[in-house]
Interface confidence: medium
């Protein structure tokens, strides 16, 4: 029985392998059940986590996860070095940054060390699961009277990236949002001098160097203007 | 700050072949990994191939395999992509990247258009 799962974040279908063995019985084999999907994510090209939920296996397994790299002169399997642990059980593996050859295919495979034949492999292109730390550095300066230019860094490469920024003032119910390209800053150009502004901003690799879906975790917020929250019916809402 | 600047770009028919050149003026390229990628209109940049500095690296996207080579000089200063077989779908703009590791590119060229027809 040969199975393709869709695994989102724009990677290549996976193909599972289930192996079907002769049963007495009309119980399924082990080998049968259906292998954890693994989850990778890229975090800043610094290391990689690949994790598997390891509470759905009918008991405590301590599976095994092996890589390589597809069409590479050198695609020799590798062990995890690395096993990440939850309750004493394997539930993912770290690879380090020279592990990580982001414009490959990935190809990892989870294998039952007492059922050997039950296995299950995925290919990953791993320029798709990056997620860059949360910008950093915000900075504002007054452009002119009424206009507003926000600044901030990423430790990464900066044309690799595309930005979000949100807006509010502690009068409104809800952030205005903006896309920004490569260049990491932000103009807004009609600012209210009797409200208080909150700024905040998030990353994605996207789309020069990858097509990755999952944003960083947002900035820091910074603010701008007077605080007007005495008068603010909303402030104390939008906090929450 | 390494400059890359790529050549060997044109207009080929399909089935014929071109040679695109990168190089670092006047220096090595100073990084692990040389790789090239490529940008078809409308569509996002892609990985087409690349190599380590020591040579032993070399890797290449299914879409190329067997049809292109990169090779490296000696000196580390100019890195090959030889194009074989070229179809249609091969036509986009050709970027040479140079960087520390094969996960990231920290230096890129201007560009060089390869128009494949039929």
């Known amino acids: 029985l040969n199975t393709t799962i869709l695994t989102p974040n724009g990677n290549e279908d996976a193909t599972t392998d289930f192996f079907l063995t002769s049963m007495p019985t009309d119980s399924l084999s082990v080998s049968t059940l259906p292998l954890p999907e693994v989850q990778c994510f890229v975090f800043n090209v610094e290391y990689m986590n690949c994790t598997w939920n390891s509470s759905s296996e009918p008991q405590p397994t301590n599976l095994t996860l092996h890589y390589w790299y597809k069409n590479s002169d050198n695609d020799k399997v590798q062990k995890c070095s690395h096993y990440l642990f939850s309750e004493e059980i394997t539930s993912g593996c770290q690879l380090q940054k020279k592990e990580i050859h982001l414009y490959q295919t990935f190809v990892v495979q989870l294998q039952d060390p007492r059922e050997p034949r039950r296995q299950a492999t995925q290919m990953l292109k791993l320029q798709n699961l990056v997620i860059p730390w949360a910008p950093e550095n915000l900075t504002l300066r007054k452009l002119s009277e009424s206009q507003l230019e926000l600044n901030w860094n990423n430790r990464f490469l900066n044309h690799c990236l595309e930005h979000l920024v949100q807006y509010r003032t502690d009068w409104d119910h809800s952030w205005t949002e903006q896309s920004v390209d490569y260049r990491h800053k932000f103009s807004l150009p009609s600012v209210d001098g009797q409200k208080r502004y909150t700024f905040r901003v998030r990353s994605r690799f996207n789309p020069l160097c990858g097509s990755a879906q999952h944003w960083s975790e947002w900035s820091h917020p910074i603010h701008w203007g007077s605080n007007s929250s005495k008068e603010n019916p909303f402030l104390f809402a939008l906090e929450a | 700050q390494v400059q890359l600047v790529e050549s060997g770009g044109g207009l080929v028919q399909a089935g014929g072949s071109l040679t695109l050149s990168c190089a670092a003026p006047g220096r090595t390229f100073g990084t692990d990994v040389v790789g090239w990628f490529r940008q078809a209109p409308g569509k996002e940049r892609e990985f087409v191939a690349s190599i380590s500095r020591s040579g032993d690296g070399i890797y290449y996207d299914d879409s190329v395999k067997g049809r292109f080579t990169i090779s490296r000089n000696n000196a580390w200063n100019t890195v090959n992509l030889q194009m074989n077989s070229l179809k249609v779908e091969d036509t986009a703009v050709y970027y040479c990247?140079?960087?520390?590791?094969?996960?990231?590119?920290?230096?890129w060229g201007q560009g060089t258009q390869v128009t494949v027809s039929s």
């Open positions: 990247a140079a960087g520390d590791g094969w996960s990231t590119y920290d230096y």
